[in-house]
């Protein structure tokens, strides 16, 4: 007789998790020598240990501690890159600004990147078939929890300029619904930022409005300000060309005014 | 650009110093204060944008004060010590576009006005 | 923030020589560095702006080079006038003030 299984609104775990998981660890600690200490075995018992055999609707912090703790790592702690809504081109910038750094240029955020996955209450298995919806289902989901304490440990870490990069074309530019908003806004450490600096992505070719006009850049700038953190914001009008800049600073059309 | 209101002062009094422009539109340029101290370099204090916005050295933060009015910007020096003996300069930042973003550079600066605090 | 550090604090150069100074910031400004000059009793004056463009009136023996973090000016065939102290600047964010100039670096003419 099949075993009534819990069918929940969202996907499932996605396919050859352990695997991957397991094959991201081996590929981020041979590229990273800093991070060649670590054991991906370990790092894959931790990162199961957090979520098996528990009801994925009551997942906690706690639960990830383990894992927390084997990947602990050191990044610049000014030269960290925050994100909402613009994950591609954040990424896409700090593979050419080598030396900057977003939560998913980490070990752990590198491990979880697009990945959804699951468990079931008492029983060891992987549930492959659905997963607990943020919305529809429940917020202590482990994907959510996953990604909640891995943000508020990376804001935490913050210092001097933090620089978050935020997407001009969505009609809410800053979301306080966001991990962004929700998380890493607040667990940035007054004492240690300086200032907070968002980049408005503008999309439109030839759109030269000021965005950082917008009312919830507005809403962002009130919320650090409180907080005892200078903001300022600025807008990358064109994208592609500013990592073509990036990339490029010495050619002829990134050194003369437009 | 000419600033105004530099003078001696007594540790403690509250000066101020008046930034008048003509031929400029201040609600479309930024207008920055920027300090020199005798046979020192150049220190910015703060910075009055066209819509407002003022942003202040974290150093100056409590001890200076900027508002504008149509034609000019002000400098409230709030309890001046010895250590704000110094030229005082303002200048016009003016934005411009380049690598698909923009950035700014202060391209008129007044004569500057002095300011000596002494007991 | 970004802070500016200028090398060298002073440099002496003869008449018809080349001067380099030096400008490091803390984090990438992405091409946005000004370079001033100001001679004594006088305000700062802009000489280039965007890292190498020239400002009105400049003449063309002063360079300005270099993007990221690093930021180089070069006065070739260098004439008396020249004699002044030249500032670098971040213009990538005027929000973020200090430490936004760099200590300064005084050319001698001899």
């Known amino acids: 007789v099949p075993r009534w299984r819990q069918q929940w609104s969202g996907p499932g775990t996605t396919k050859r998790f352990p695997e991957t998981v397991l094959a991201r660890c081996v590929k981020y600690t041979e590229i990273h020598p800093e991070m060649r200490h670590v054991d991906c075995q370990s790092v894959w018992d931790a990162f199961k240990g957090a979520f098996i055999s528990k009801h994925p609707c009551n997942i906690t912090e706690e639960d990830y501690q383990p894992l927390m703790k084997l990947g602990t790592q050191t990044v610049p702690c000014n030269k960290i890159l925050l994100w909402s809504r613009i994950k591609d081109l954040a990424h896409q910038f700090t593979q050419v600004q080598r030396d900057m750094f977003t939560l998913e240029d980490t070990l752990l955020g590198y491990l979880a990147d697009d990945l959804t996955w699951c468990g079931e209450f008492n029983t060891s298995k992987i549930n492959y078939q659905s997963c607990p919806d943020w919305r529809k289902d429940c917020s202590n989901n482990p994907v959510s929890v996953f990604w909640k304490t891995v943000s508020r440990r990376f804001a935490e870490a913050a210092c001097d300029v933090v620089h978050v990069m935020l997407n001009g074309s969505r009609s809410k530019i800053f979301d306080k619904n966001s991990t962004f908003g929700s998380v890493e806004v607040h667990n940035l450490q007054p004492e240690k930022v300086q200032t907070l600096e968002a980049w408005v992505i503008h999309g439109g070719r030839e759109d030269s409005r000021d965005l950082c006009q917008d009312p919830t850049i507005k809403e962002l700038e009130s919320i650090i300000s409180k907080r005892n953190i200078q903001f300022s914001c600025k807008n990358i009008y064109r994208p592609d060309k500013f990592l073509q800049c990036v990339k490029n600073p010495e050619d002829s059309s990134c050194t003369s005014e437009i | 650009v000419e600033e105004s209101g530099g003078r001696l002062v007594t540790p403690g009094t509250p000066l101020t110093l008046t930034c008048t422009v003509s031929g400029i539109d201040l609600n479309s340029y930024a207008m920055g204060w920027v300090r020199q101290a005798p046979g020192k370099g150049l220190k910015y204090i703060g910075i009055?944008?066209?819509?407002?916005n003022i942003y202040y050295a974290n150093w100056a933060k409590g001890r200076f004060t900027i508002s504008k009015t149509s034609t000019t910007v002000d400098l409230r020096i709030t309890s001046p010590t010895t250590e704000d003996t110094a030229t005082y300069f303002c200048?016009?930042?003016?934005?411009?576009?380049?690598?698909?973003?923009?950035?700014?550079?202060?391209?008129?600066w007044g004569q500057g006005t002095l300011v000596t605090v002494s007991s | 923030a970004y802070d500016m550090t200028q090398t060298p604090a002073s440099v002496e150069a003869a008449v018809g020589g080349t001067v380099t100074i030096k400008c490091q910031a803390s984090?990438?400004?992405?091409?946005?560095l000004n370079w001033y000059q100001q001679k004594p009793g006088q305000p700062p004056k802009l000489l280039i702006y965007y890292a190498s463009t020239l400002a009105f009136g400049v003449p063309s023996r002063f360079k300005g080079s270099g993007s990221g973090t690093e930021y180089t000016l070069t006065i070739s065939g260098v004439e008396s006038a020249d004699a002044a102290t030249y500032y670098c600047?971040?213009?990538?964010?005027?929000?973020?003030?200090?430490?936004?100039f760099g200590g300064g670096t005084e050319v001698v003419v001899k």
């Open positions: 200048a016009r930042e003016r934005e411009f576009y380049g690598g698909g973003t923009s950035g700014s550079r202060l391209d008129l």
């Open positions: 009055m944008t066209s819509g407002g």
């Open positions: 984090q990438s400004i992405y091409n946005f």
């Open positions: 600047q971040q213009g990538w964010n005027s929000g973020i003030l200090d430490n936004s």
